[in-house]
């Protein structure tokens, strides 16, 4: 069987939701010593980066300027050490936002609720769209989808303080082209005695996994890597 290197990790820097005409940055984190990284879009080669010097950095950044609907879709990356290629990374969905119009978001019974009440978000957008998306700030990976002609509903079940936070919705013209975001709706949940101390409000900074953690190798890391390599050989 053909030998391959472990798959790299692909991430979007700051967010996978990129406003049209803005720059998207994707990171591919592979291995020290990788001489080439390839970015693939919808299965085809999209860009190539060669780190300098390859042995001192464990990944690269791919800059995608002037984001538009043609560049929105599924990305993956691979890397090469010598003649050996890695497995393909997981797929990353890159979305273009700020297309066309702005939806409105409403919440029933209202933005201030008590624990145990059932809440429904309603997203409305008059221009032709069939899919709507609801996102909670600080939880942008947890996208809820709903369908409707001009509006869609997002029932939330009995709420707890874990539901507190800011919500926005988008209309979607396809999976990767979204509208402008709605104005945020801040949901306040009170009276959850059992959970209050355990459920702080969600952070308002971007999702922690939407950051590129590319590191330059230090002398110490090199010594550790060499020690690890020697230890592995001894074990063999």
């Amino acid at each position: 069987p053909k030998q391959t290197l472990p798959k790299p990790i692909i991430r979007a820097e700051s967010t996978y939701m990129v406003p049209k005409e803005k720059q998207a940055t994707l990171c591919c984190q592979g291995s020290y010593g990788a001489v080439e990284y390839q970015l693939h879009f919808e299965g085809s080669l999209f860009a190539v980066e060669r780190p300098k010097p390859p042995e001192r950095i464990n990944g690269v950044k791919f800059h995608i300027p002037d984001m538009n609907s043609r560049k929105a879709g599924r990305y993956s990356c691979i890397y090469r050490v010598g003649e050996l290629w890695s497995e393909r990374s997981d797929l990353l969905d890159l979305v273009v936002t700020e297309m066309y119009d702005t939806p409105t978001l409403s919440v029933h019974p209202g933005p201030e609720v008590t624990s145990g009440e059932k809440v429904t978000f309603y997203c409305r957008l008059d221009t032709a769209t069939s899919m709507f998306l609801l996102l909670k700030e600080g939880r942008s990976r947890d996208v809820q989808r709903s369908y409707g002609k001009v509006q869609a509903e997002f029932p939330m079940g009995p709420v707890t303080t874990a539901h507190r936070g800011s919500y926005r919705c988008f209309g979607s013209y396809n999976n990767y082209a979204w509208s402008f975001p709605s104005e945020p709706v801040k949901l306040l949940v009170t009276g959850d005695i059992e959970n209050t101390s355990l459920a702080p409000t969600d952070p308002t900074f971007p999702d922690s996994w939407d950051t590129c953690l590319l590191t330059r190798e230090t002398g110490l890391q090199k010594d550790l890597a060499l020690w690890d390599h020697t230890a592995q050989n001894l074990l063999r």
Partner: antibody
């Protein structure tokens, strides 16, 4: 204080339409849902639908989808419900109720459908 | 649609008596339940929201509670103005639905 003003009565002919009004005061009209509720003489209450004045989101009881149309005029803080193709079954008191949890109620408009 | 079964449909009681009205929900509604009072002239007023929260200006003799799918309105000591109609209302799942009502009469 919060007030929802509705006309006392409307007399309409079978087959005609009527547009009921509900003028809100004492709160931020655009921030809260407005519901409409039907009560037939000596009967219980039935929810017709609701509208959010700010977003224009409407939600109807399927039973009333072809009967009622909800609209708002933000400039006058007034909600409207148009009832079409009226029959004797539509003779009832119609209430508007402000806030998602039905906190504030109008006095109701008695609609009588009669030739 | 969620059915709200309200009982009793009518109740005779005396001044100062403690009474409880009940609504049973056919599906889970969480705490999304109101109790409303309707005067003989048709005026409707909300007494309780979110199962047990008392509206401002409503006398403390009114209280709301829940046990499973049963929701109760209790009046601890009846006064003359309490002999009117009462309705429960669920706002958990659209269409929002009302109980059939309870007519509270003086004995």
């Amino acid at each position: 204080q919060v007030q929802l003003q509705q006309p006392g009565a409307e007399l309409v002919k079978p087959g005609a339409s009527v547009k009921l009004s509900c003028k809100a005061s004492g709160y931020t009209f655009t921030s809260y849902w407005m519901h409409w509720v039907k009560q037939r003489p000596g009967q219980g209450l039935e929810w017709i639908g609701m509208i959010h004045p700010n977003s224009g989101v409407t939600k109807y009881n399927e039973k009333f989808k072809s009967k009622a149309t909800l609209t708002v005029d933000k400039s006058s803080s007034t909600a409207y419900m148009q009832l079409s193709s009226l029959t004797s079954e539509d003779s009832a008191v119609y209430f508007c109720a402000g806030d998602g949890r039905f906190a504030y109620w109008g006095q109701g408009t008695l609609v009588t459908v009669s030739a | 649609d969620i059915q709200m079964t309200q009982s009793p449909s009518s109740l005779s009681a005396s001044l100062g008596e403690r009474v409880s009205l009940t609504c049973r929900a056919s599906q889970d509604i969480g705490s999304s339940l109101n109790w409303l009072q309707q005067e003989p002239d048709g005026t409707i007023k909300r007494l309780i929201y979110a199962t047990s929260s008392l509206d401002s200006g409503v006398p403390k003799r009114f209280s709301g509670s829940r046990s499973g799918s049963d929701y109760s309105l209790t009046i601890s000591s009846l006064e003359s103005e309490d002999f009117v109609d009462y309705y429960c209302l669920q706002y958990a799942s659209s269409p929002w639905t009302f109980g059939g009502g309870t007519k509270l009469e003086i004995k």
